[in-house]
């Protein structure tokens, strides 16, 4: 079976790499124009140059194309915790990332925010924070993870998944709570 | 205490229009980010959009994008999303959230609004 390809991929594919068919003339391979320019006119003939120019400020091409416009440049989100880690240039986009001690946590392949790395109070590193993923802790005893903190077994409640981490505590709260009892 | 109510769902046909409305209480509205996020039959939560406290430079999930809008009006506490040309995979009830601040999960979201989109 042979995959289907889409119209541009079928034009490109007839001609060799670093080039594309003439969108009027399928017997003419243009030459591609190179990252950071856009195709501001199509090869007149074959051998000729194509006519590519540069990005304008605000825009970029990260790769050689023959697009009729330049990408824009992406914004880092404030409200998302976002920091500018690099600006665009016209054959890169802005790179966006998070402060010291922050990781990104993403909610869609292209949306991020960031949050701060868990200290893990009441507990130790069991793996350090990293770019893509919170610090992992392990409780001390006495302590159960709820939302990657440590929280006193005093918090737990019997429907809570903590009842077996806790399990001990829970029982010593129950017999003092029987004890009392007359 | 903080109450999101969400409404304006219901059933509609392929191609056609609804606008979800969310009356926030309990904190100051006008400071917080606004989301809107959604669960179809079955499915994870979906991050459709949200709008920064002054209303500038929305986002939208690429599935959304140029089909539904996100406002918000701050003096009536309100978030809307207007959805246009809808399909049948916008099928979900969708609810409005405060953007997360302490870490990956939702504190305060609504019980959510259903929308069918019937093909």
């Known amino acids: 079976l042979v995959p289907h390809l889409g119209d541009r991929e079928k034009r490109d594919s007839v001609c060799p790499q670093g080039k594309y068919i003439h969108p009027q003339n399928n017997s003419i391979c243009c030459t591609k124009c190179h990252k950071g320019t856009y195709l501001y006119n199509d090869c007149p003939g074959p051998g000729q140059d194509t006519d590519c120019r540069e990005c304008e400020s605000g825009s970029f091409t990260a790769s050689e194309n023959h697009l009729r416009h330049c990408l824009s440049c992406s914004k880092c989100r404030k409200e998302m915790g976002q920091v500018e880690i690099s600006s665009c240039t016209v054959d890169r986009d802005t790179v966006c990332g998070c402060r010291k001690n922050q990781y990104r946590h993403y909610w869609s392949e292209n949306l991020f925010q960031c949050f701060n790395c868990s200290l893990c109070l009441n507990g130790t590193v069991h793996l350090s924070c990293q770019e893509k993923q919170n610090t992992v802790c392990t409780c001390h005893a006495g302590f159960f993870l709820r939302e990657n903190e440590c929280v006193s077994c005093s918090n737990c409640k019997k429907s809570l998944e903590c009842t077996k981490l806790c399990l001990p505590q829970i029982e010593n709260v129950k017999g003092t709570e029987d004890s009392g009892t007359t | 205490e903080v109450q999101l109510l969400e409404s304006g769902g219901g059933l509609v046909q392929a191609g056609g229009s609804l606008r979800l409305s969310c009356a926030a209480s309990?904190?100051?509205?006008?400071?917080?980010?606004m989301v809107w996020v959604r669960q179809a039959p079955g499915k994870g939560l979906e991050w459709v959009s949200h709008?920064?406290?002054?209303?500038?430079?929305?986002f939208y999930a690429d599935s959304v994008k140029g089909r539904f809008t996100i406002s918000r009006d701050n003096s009536k506490n309100t978030l809307y999303l207007q959805m246009n040309s809808l399909r049948a995979e916008d099928t979900a009830v969708y609810s409005c959230?405060?953007?997360?601040?302490?870490?990956?999960?939702?504190?305060?979201w609504g019980q959510g609004t259903l929308v069918t989109v019937s093909s």
């Open positions: 709008i920064p406290p002054d209303g500038q430079d929305p």
């Open positions: 959230a405060l953007l997360p601040k302490r870490g990956p999960w939702f504190d305060y």
């Open positions: 309990g904190f100051t509205f006008a400071h917080e980010t």
